[in-house]
Structures are given as C-alpha cells and as structure tokens.
C-alpha cells in the first residue's frame, strides 16, 4: 500500500466503514515521534491525530473516526514541520468488514443453511468454510448475502464451520482485508458439539441387505 517516500511504508485499514487505522514503518525515523496530520475534505485545514498508536514508545500509527465516509483521506506524516510522506487515498479501497454476527445454522437432512446479520453496506461476499476430520483442507462456499446453503453433507460426520466477510474485488479493488473469522462451531447430526475429533473414527461397516 505504501509507496516509499523517504523510506516510509504505510498501511491503511478502514474497519467496517467506521474507523481508519493508518500505520507507518519508517526505518530512517525509527526513534522519532512522527506526527500524523489529516483531513477528509480537500477544503478543510489539516487536523493532527489525537489517537496515536505507539511502538516501542514512539508513534507508529493513528486511529481516526470515519463513520460511513465514501471519501478521500488526505494525510501527511511529518518529522516536526517536515513532511516525510504525503498522500490522498480513497478509504474504502482498504476496507476490512466486521466479523459476522448472530451466526445461525439450520439443518435439513444432508444440507445446512448458514445465516448471519448482513452488514449495512453492500458489494460483499459472505464466505462459509467447513471441514470434517476426514477432509484434508477446508471446503468453501460464498454468497452475496449471509444466507449460504451447503448441500451434500454426511449426517454422520462432525463438521467444523466458520464464517467471514470479504469485500468484492471488482468493486473495492485488491487491497481490502477479509473480516476476522467467526468462532468455529462444530456440528454433527444437526446438533452442536464442543469439538470434532481430530482423528476420524473409522466408518461403521455397512450391513449387507
């Protein structure tokens, strides 16, 4: 994300269209308290950050309130009065949606429908990953709303599920972040379990008819 202007690397994360976090890594200024100055509108005067992030006692980032802004963040990272990095960025390019809330599972024979609360903004993908101890890797299914049906499950197997939200790349571009995963939930025969056994139990022998 950060172009190297005087060796400064930046990272921007826009948490759920609520809070912007800008962090910097400036090896040349590693023992310096750089200051962060910003504005959301090209006409305003710059404000200085009031909520700095610190690393080893020195400023390394800033947290800004930016509720639901489809806007450009103009910012300047300064050593005293000297700007060491200045930029303008569309904040939504760095969106990180919040983790899914109110995740629910509705079972019907060999299928489960996973639902959760849709976020208030759009152009998102809701991804469910699942696996049984018999699977070597996670399986995945995603939809435009948090209503994902997974079919062809084995009712006898225990499955682990978790859910996350991703911003559509076609809309927000390649620099967004997926949400954190929801907690892992384990299910077997339509009932919640504490965990799925790490080593799969051997399948029951099929009785010949």
């Amino acid at each position: 994300q950060g172009g190297a202007a005087e060796g400064v690397q930046i990272q921007i994360i826009y948490f759920n269209l609520e809070t912007v976090q800008v962090t910097w890594n400036a090896s040349k200024y590693s023992r310096t308290n750089l200051t962060f100055h910003y504005r959301f509108n090209g006409d305003e005067a710059y404000d200085q950050c009031t909520n700095y992030l610190l690393q080893e006692g020195h400023t390394s980032g800033c947290l800004l309130d930016a509720e639901q802004r489809d806007d450009i963040l103009y910012f300047s990272i300064r050593n005293g009065t000297h700007p060491v990095f200045t930029a303008s960025r569309w904040m939504v390019y760095y969106l990180k949606p919040s983790s899914p809330k109110h995740v629910r599972f509705s079972w019907h024979q060999d299928a489960v429908t996973v639902t959760c609360s849709d976020l208030s903004y759009g152009d998102l993908l809701y991804e469910v990953q699942y696996r049984s101890p018999f699977d070597t890797e996670w399986q995945s299914k995603q939809e435009n709303t948090c209503n994902v049906t997974i079919e062809g499950l084995d009712a006898e197997k225990c499955y682990s599920f978790w859910v996350r939200v991703k911003a559509m790349e076609d809309v927000y571009g390649p620099d967004t972040y997926p949400s954190d995963w929801s907690e892992v939930t384990c299910w077997q025969r339509g009932e919640i379990r504490d965990a799925c056994a790490e080593t799969p139990t051997p399948p029951k022998p099929k009785l010949s008819k």
């Epitope: 994300q1 950060g2 172009g3 202007a5 090209g42 802004r69 489809d70 806007d71 450009i72 103009y74 930029a87 303008s88 960025r89 569309w90 939504v92 390019y93 903004y121 759009g122 152009d123 809309v171 927000y172 571009g173 390649p174 620099d175």
Partner: antibody, heavy 125, light 106 residues
Amino acid sequence: EVQLLESGGGLVQPGGSLRLSCAASGFTFSSYAMNWVRQAPGKGLEWVSGISGSGGSTYYADSVKGRFTFSRDNSKNTLYLQMISLRAEDTAVYYCAKDQRITMVRGVIGAFDIWGQGTMVTVSS
Amino acid sequence: DIQMTQSPSTLSASVGDRVTITCRASQSISSWLAWYQQKPGKAPKLLIYKASSLESGVPSRFSGSGSGTEFTLTISSLQPDDFATYYCQQYVGLITFGQGTRLEIK
C-alpha cells in the same frame, strides 16, 4: 446511446466568470460519479473536478480549488462547472466524463468510460 | 499529489510492430491505473482499467500489466488506427494523468 454534451465555453477576460454545462443521456445519471477534465492547447490531460452520484461530495484539483464549483442537477441529468477568477492558464478544452463504475461505493472516482466532445474556454484580454 | 511519468514521450513504430509504453507512479497505486487513447481533436477513449482489465469493445491487441509503481501498455501488433497519443491515469486518490506518449508512424 450513452452521451455527454458540453456547452457554455467561450472567450472571457482574465478575472471573469463562466459556467459550463454538461447534458447527459442514455444512463442512470444519479448512479455515477462525474468529472471535468481539461486539456490546454497542445498539452496533456488535467483532471479538474469530480462529484459523487448524489452530488453530496465534490473534489477539486489544487489548481482550481476555491475558484471552481462543481454541481449537478440529477432531475435534469445535467452537470455544471461554475468558474470564477479565471486566469490565462485556465484556457483549455473542457471535457465532462462519466465514471465507469456503478457501485455501493458512491463517492469513489475511477476510470472514465464516456467523454463529451469538449467545449473550448479561452481566457484572454 | 502522485506524479505519473510516462516513457517514452514519443515513440516511432510501424504497422505490425509490438510496442510498449511505460508509466511510473511516484507512490504505490496498487492496481488503480487506467490507459486512454486520444486522437487529434477528439476526446480520450478508455482502453484499460484497473491496470489490466480490457474495456468493453477495445481490441484484444491492447493489454495492460503491472502493479504498485510500474505499469505497461502493450499493443501486440500495431494497426494504422493505433497511431495516437496514450495517457495513463491513477485513481487511488485524487486523479492524476501521465504527460502522454505520442505514437507516430516511423
């Protein structure tokens, strides 16, 4: 057919004012961010200003900030660029241009897929 | 502002040639880059967006690549209609264009 048609250009003295218009047709006008881009004679392209689909957010190049005002009337599918305190260096062909994307990201300005034919603004005494 | 620098400023080539135009950004712009073609007295025409996506209706001989700070526009086999001026444009923040590359007949 998607179309943009600029008007309002002409000759104006330094310090004078002018209002450009851009009439849009063939697409859902209020869903798209729109822009003005200018080109001085024999020179390259310079982005001047952008506006969100709703008109709630406007953006300006430093070279015109405080002198130009970009607005839109979505009921008339029309853009306006009010220019005051004009200078010789504002002499250019002014194009209106449509943002390529329709998304929930309402303010973001991106690539421009439809351009008008341009209107010439000459600032000279 | 982010500076966009195109090279070369002028390029002489012949029909059938493969040509490449480079655009460099003064800061990382990820993939937020577009390419335009402009002919004298005409409005620019969008060719490529998001660094490598071909705009609808644009011939497949045009292609774009790159990310971060270095980008290229390639025309695989020049056609007579391709002699024009080409501009890159970044849109990671406030828009800026490159200074242009004039592609002329050798």
